[in-house]
């Protein structure tokens, strides 16, 4: 088992994740593990010396950086909120606040916007990941309705009048529920047609 530092004529190292090629000395040196940085560079006789990232800084990967990255907050004004704190090994984890989606992305979400309302008769298509994109409104399926303009309202099944011992007075639509009435109630004049034999 060859341990760093070791010479490399072809400029490649055995373990690409944990080692790097140092061209000045033509050697392979150890990278520093996550949560640390290079405090002393390697030489032909000595491997890389690593030190732990200071508070409020981090390095996520095996690296040969001479500094740690500064932890950044999740700015509420940008629609972001924190879901996990920054550690020496991981940046602050942010997400869009409820009812929002990521509107600007640069390696990570930088700005969120409010989800669009879905009009009556529709609902937002369910997404694999919350906050990833704006609402895509789809019509309520048969036998369902949704009667508000809302980013999050779901289509509900039409009421089944017979389940409540009632009869249907008016059928449900995509935007309204079924109207029920008591069987004993007489129909309004416009609905009671006279049947002539």
């Amino acid at each position: 088992q060859v341990v760093p530092p070791y010479g490399s004529e072809n400029q490649t190292c055995r373990d690409q994740e944990k080692e790097y090629y140092e061209p000045r000395h033509r050697i392979c040196c150890s990278r520093c593990p996550p949560g640390t940085y290079v405090s002393a560079k390697c030489s032909r006789s000595r491997d890389t010396v690593c030190a732990t990232c200071a508070e409020n800084s981090y390095n996520e990967h095996w690296n040969y950086l001479t500094i740690c990255q500064l932890c950044r907050p999740c700015d509420p004004v940008m629609g972001l909120e924190e879901i996990a704190p920054c550690t020496s090994k991981r940046k602050t984890q942010c997400r869009c606040q409820p009812g929002m989606f990521c509107a600007a992305w640069a390696l990570e979400c930088t700005h969120c916007e409010l989800l669009s309302d879905c009009p009556p008769g529709t609902e937002a298509e369910l997404k694999d990941e919350v906050g990833k994109g704006n609402n895509h409104c789809v019509p309520c399926k048969a036998g369902h309705f949704q009667n508000t303009s809302s980013p999050s309202a779901r289509c509900q099944p039409h009421t089944r009048c017979e389940d409540q011992g009632l009869v249907e007075a008016a059928p449900g639509t995509a935007q309204s529920d079924t109207t029920c009435r008591n069987p004993s109630e007489s129909l309004p004049p416009e609905m009671s047609g006279t049947m002539l034999m």
């Epitope: 999740c74 509420p76 004004v77 940008m78 629609g79 972001l80 909120e81 924190e82 879901i83 704190p85 606040q97 409820p98 009812g99 929002m100 969120c112 409010l114």
Partner: nanobody
Framework: EVQLVESGGGLVQPGGSLRLSCKAS????????FGWYRQAPGKQRELVAT???????WYDVSVKGRFIISRDNPENTVYLQMNSLRPEDTAVYYC??????WGQGTLVTVSS
């Protein structure tokens, strides 16, 4: 449109304490994360503390261990408890959230 009104600032001696309040209106309060920001004379506004909808908190290194951010959802209010105040904490303090209008802020002066 979200309106925010900050209060509770004043003149305090080094080592003293203050509690800032921020009353919000025009938003579903419990669905919003909030931040306390400050702007010292001649400097840029900086974020000092945040609180998420779930109550997770973040603090800038300069105030960690001294300031405590909290929220009262029924009262639509966010607080900033400031302890062990230092002269360098002197600034106008603002609270804000998504689509919030920057309020007048509240002036905190730490001086003997």
């Amino acid at each position: 449109e979200v309106q925010l009104v900050e209060s509770g600032g004043g003149l305090v001696q080094p080592g003293g304490s203050l509690r800032l309040s921020c009353k919000a209106s025009g938003t579903t309060f419990s669905d919003r994360a909030f931040g306390w920001y400050r702007q010292a004379p001649g400097k840029q506004r900086e974020l000092v503390a945040t609180i998420s909808t779930a109550g997770l908190t973040w603090y800038d290194v300069s105030v960690k261990g001294r300031f405590i951010i909290s929220r009262d959802n029924p009262e639509n209010t966010v607080y900033l408890q400031m302890n062990s105040l230092r002269p360098e904490d002197t600034a106008v303090y603002y609270c804000n959230t998504f689509r919030g209008n920057w309020g007048q802020g509240t002036l905190v002066t730490v001086s003997s």
